[in-house]
């Protein structure tokens, strides 16, 4: 004969556990149903009645099967330096990530809590390490024979043009000026234009501090705390 299927609520076998999408209620001492994502427990189970679930209200959510009595509040609206990459629904929190030209200086569980503008390397300095979604640009002084004449978060130091006859010698912030009509460029290794990083979703890493910060680096904090983790995890 096949084993009888127990319907919730039911008392688990001694030392046994409840099934998937059920939880052990310590007060009722029964295995009871969890509520699906997008819902919460409106009425907890008793020995004879199962959990009663209800939909999350506007601007609240549950992402997991759960038995929380209240849905979690969605995070506050994304700030001006951020873009909303995931909307607040009954089943998921809003996710804000940094917009292009910014990086995540302080990440949270999902998305970013604090965005900062990418450092711009001033003339005489080039990008040594490009910015990522979670780290700032690292600038370095242009080595002899190279220059950067821009204030940029993407431009690297480029080699001076090689003149047959030099009119004005180049320096770290200016290219050489030739009198000759056909100057040539020396090919320095890695002399390529670095694209601006595309901001997608933040990871849990801290930004690396670096020298030569351009004046006016700004930080913007979103309003309000991030919501707490749900009361139950997994299925």
């Amino acid at each position: 004969l096949p084993a009888q299927v127990a319907f919730t609520p039911y008392a688990p076998e001694p030392g046994g556990t409840c099934r998937l999408r059920e939880y052990y209620d310590q007060t009722a001492q029964m295995c009871c149903s969890k509520c699906p994502p997008g819902q919460h427990a409106k009425v907890f189970c008793t020995k004879t009645s199962d959990t009663v679930c209800d939909s999350c209200e506007d601007s609240t959510y549950t992402q997991l099967w759960n038995w929380v009595p209240e849905c979690l509040s969605c995070g506050s609206r994304c700030s001006s330096d951020q873009v909303e990459t995931q909307a607040c629904t009954r089943e998921q929190n809003r996710i804000c990530t940094c917009r292009p030209g910014w990086y995540c200086a302080l990440s949270k569980q999902e998305g970013c809590r604090l965005c900062a503008q990418l450092r711009k390397c001033r003339p005489g300095f080039g990008v040594a390490r490009p910015g990522t979604e979670t780290s700032d640009v690292v600038c370095k002084p242009c080595a002899p024979g190279t220059f950067s004449n821009t204030t940029s978060s993407t431009d690297i130091c480029r080699p001076h043009q090689i003149c047959h006859v030099v009119a004005i010698p180049g320096n770290a912030s200016m290219d050489a000026v030739c009198t000759s009509t056909s100057p040539t460029r020396s090919m320095a290794p890695g002399a390529v234009h670095l694209p601006q990083p595309v901001s997608t979703r933040s990871q849990h890493t801290q930004p690396t501090p670096a020298p030569s910060t351009a004046p006016g680096t700004s930080f913007l904090l979103p309003v309000g705390p991030s919501p707490p983790a749900e009361g139950s995890t997994g299925d």
Partner: antibody, heavy 119, light 106 residues
């Protein structure tokens, strides 16, 4: 609005049985998630949960007093009755009834009734 | 049974002071804690449930926080009408009240 009121004897003798009635209005014990419980408070001391009953007749008792307590309900009369046997002077207290929400906390309380156990 | 250890048992503070009361459970109670205010000769009044959810009509100077076994109740700026005894209630595993904290004005 929700109201609860306790009634019962003000004085009982040791070894006697105490019977308390909670009469409530503003909600029904036939509604899913509704419960009524009893809590007591000896003079100058802390609150102590005694027992409660749910809409589906599920009952819970304080483990340390379980052998002495019985709770029942009369849904049509909007009443819950608690009996406590073998009363002792240490059971002298103010006895409160309170409504329980579906998520198990007490949200509305009666004014309380004082019971003295003395010979 | 879950035991609830509430501290301090009494405190004296000035009007405008920040007042903090703690309750420690003997086991994890999953945020199922409520806080009540009781004035002499009156029934307890629910202030907060599920750790931090304020009841409608309760002033925002009252707040709650915590998780696991440790919970805190705070009055951000004590008012004369807040003089009372405060109790925590755990309802994660049956029901147990803390021993109470009597709040007085200096």
């Amino acid at each position: 609005q929700v109201t609860l009121k306790e009634s019962g004897p003000a004085l009982v003798k040791p070894t006697q049985t105490l019977t308390l009635t909670c009469t409530f209005s503003g909600f029904s014990l036939s509604t899913s998630g509704m419960g009524v419980g009893w809590i007591r408070q000896p003079p100058g001391k802390a609150l102590e949960w005694l027992a409660h009953i749910w809409w589906d007749d599920d009952k819970f008792y304080n483990p340390s007093l379980k052998s002495r307590l019985t709770i029942s309900k009369d849904t049509s009369k909007n009443q819950v009755v608690l009996t406590m046997t073998n009363m002792d002077p240490v059971d002298t207290a103010t006895y409160y009834c309170a409504r329980l929400t579906g998520t198990r906390y007490f949200d509305y309380w009666g004014q309380g009734t004082t019971v003295t156990v003395s010979s | 049974d879950v035991q609830m250890t509430q501290s301090p048992s009494s405190l004296s503070a000035s009007v405008g002071d920040r007042v903090t009361i703690t309750c420690k459970a003997s086991q994890d109670i999953n945020k199922f804690i409520a806080w009540y205010q009781q004035k002499p000769g009156k029934a307890p009044k629910l202030l907060i449930h599920y750790t931090s959810t304020l009841q409608p009509g309760i002033p925002s100077r009252f707040s709650g926080s915590g998780s696991g076994r440790d919970y805190t109740f705070t009055i951000s700026s004590l008012q004369p009408e807040d003089i009372a005894t405060y109790y925590c209630l755990q309802y994660g595993n049956l029901w147990t009240f803390g021993g109470g904290t009597k709040v007085e004005i200096k």
